[in-house]
């Protein structure tokens, strides 16, 4: 059985389209499961992995490896 584009698995009922945009940064494995690109995490791979040591409470990042501080906090790790 050959599945349609972006469909995987037994019965071709698993859908996965690789994407690299605001809504996700991932490839699809042979079973149609998302595999996040380096630097991204979460079920949709749309959450950037911040700089190692970045304060989870006072820092955040839009892009991997970044660490943006909340107002009132500073430093490399916003701590």
């Amino acid at each position: 059985v050959t599945c349609d584009d972006y469909y995987y698995g037994f019965g071709c009922n698993k859908f996965c389209r690789p994407r690299d945009d605001f809504f996700g940064h991932y490839a699809c494995d042979q079973n149609g499961n998302k595999t996040c690109m380096e630097g991204w995490m979460g079920p949709e791979c749309n959450r950037a992995i911040c700089r190692q040591g970045c304060s989870p409470k006072h820092g955040s990042c839009k892009l991997p490896g970044d660490c943006r501080c909340q107002y009132g906090w500073q430093g490399l790790y916003c701590d």
Partner: antibody, heavy 119, light 107 residues
Framework: QVQLVQSGAELKKPGSSVKVSCKAS????????MHWVRQAPGQGLEWMGA????????AYNQKFKGRVTLTADKSTSTAYMELSSLRSEDTAVYYC????????????WGQGTLVTVSS | DIQMTQSPSSLSASVGDRVTITCRAS??????LAWYQQKPGKAPKLLIY???TLADAVPSRFSGSGSGTDYTLTISSLQPEDFATYYC?????????FGGGTKLEIK
């Protein structure tokens, strides 16, 4: 279970701004972007934009660029949509909505917030 | 931006009828299409995603088909609770636009 609870109805003057809130529960807030969709009375649905609460990244419908601002507060799992320079055509029900799992589109919706713009 | 053209805009039918609503995208959306049902005063409810997959707890009388730019929602045997407005929506690339809607009324 996933729940999205929005703030109450608003009556606004033309030229002013409105800020609608959407409190999320039942899932990890930072795992999914929050989208905003509006519906004018008797009209269809219009996607306004989305925010990734984890890092604050945003995507906007160009139609609203410059007038709409999406923000999120991770500490309270609340997303906000602020629309400025209001005009009568902005009278609509505003919905926050979230994708489901495994690439669903909008599986979860808030109850909607009616914003009326009138002088 | 990809535009979605939905037809018909309104439709009268009877309980038990088979009904088809179509949606055409201005570009290839690769099955990234959803169908919603909306009743007055309520938020839309997801029926079908990825063109043909039924959302949770949606009755099997609803089905979706299509590929490329042309997609169809079919209700095999209308029930009284199916009279509502139906919207298609693509989610291939931002902005994620909706069709204009199809109001399904009782004949």
């Amino acid at each position: 279970q996933v729940q999205l609870v929005q703030s109450g109805a608003e009556l606004k003057k033309p030229g002013s701004s409105v800020k609608v809130s959407c409190k999320a529960s039942g899932y990890t807030f930072t795992d999914y972007e929050m989208h905003w969709v509006r519906q004018a009375p008797g009209q269809g649905l219009e996607w306004m934009g989305a925010i990734q609460p984890g890092g604050g990244g945003t995507a906007y419908n160009q139609k609203f660029k410059g007038r709409v601002t999406l923000t999120a507060d991770k500490s309270t799992s609340t997303a906000y949509m602020e629309l400025s320079s209001l005009r009568s055509e902005d009278t609509a029900v505003y919905y926050c909505t979230r994708r489901g799992y495994d690439d669903y589109p909008f599986a979860y919706w808030g109850q909607g917030t009616l914003v009326t713009v009138s002088s | 931006d990809i535009q979605m053209t939905q037809s018909p805009s309104s439709l009268s039918a009877s309980v038990g009828d088979r009904v088809t609503i179509t949606c055409r995208a201005s570009g290839n959306i690769h099955n990234y299409l959803a169908w919603y049902q909306q009743k007055p005063g309520k938020a839309p409810k997801l029926l079908i995603y990825n063109a043909k997959t039924l959302a949770d707890a949606v009755p099997s009388r609803f089905s979706g088909s299509g590929s490329g730019t042309d997609y169809t929602l079919t209700i095999s045997s209308l029930q009284p609770e199916d009279f509502a407005t139906y919207y298609c929506q693509h989610f291939w690339s931002a902005p994620w636009t909706f069709g204009g809607g199809t109001k399904l009324e009782i004949k």
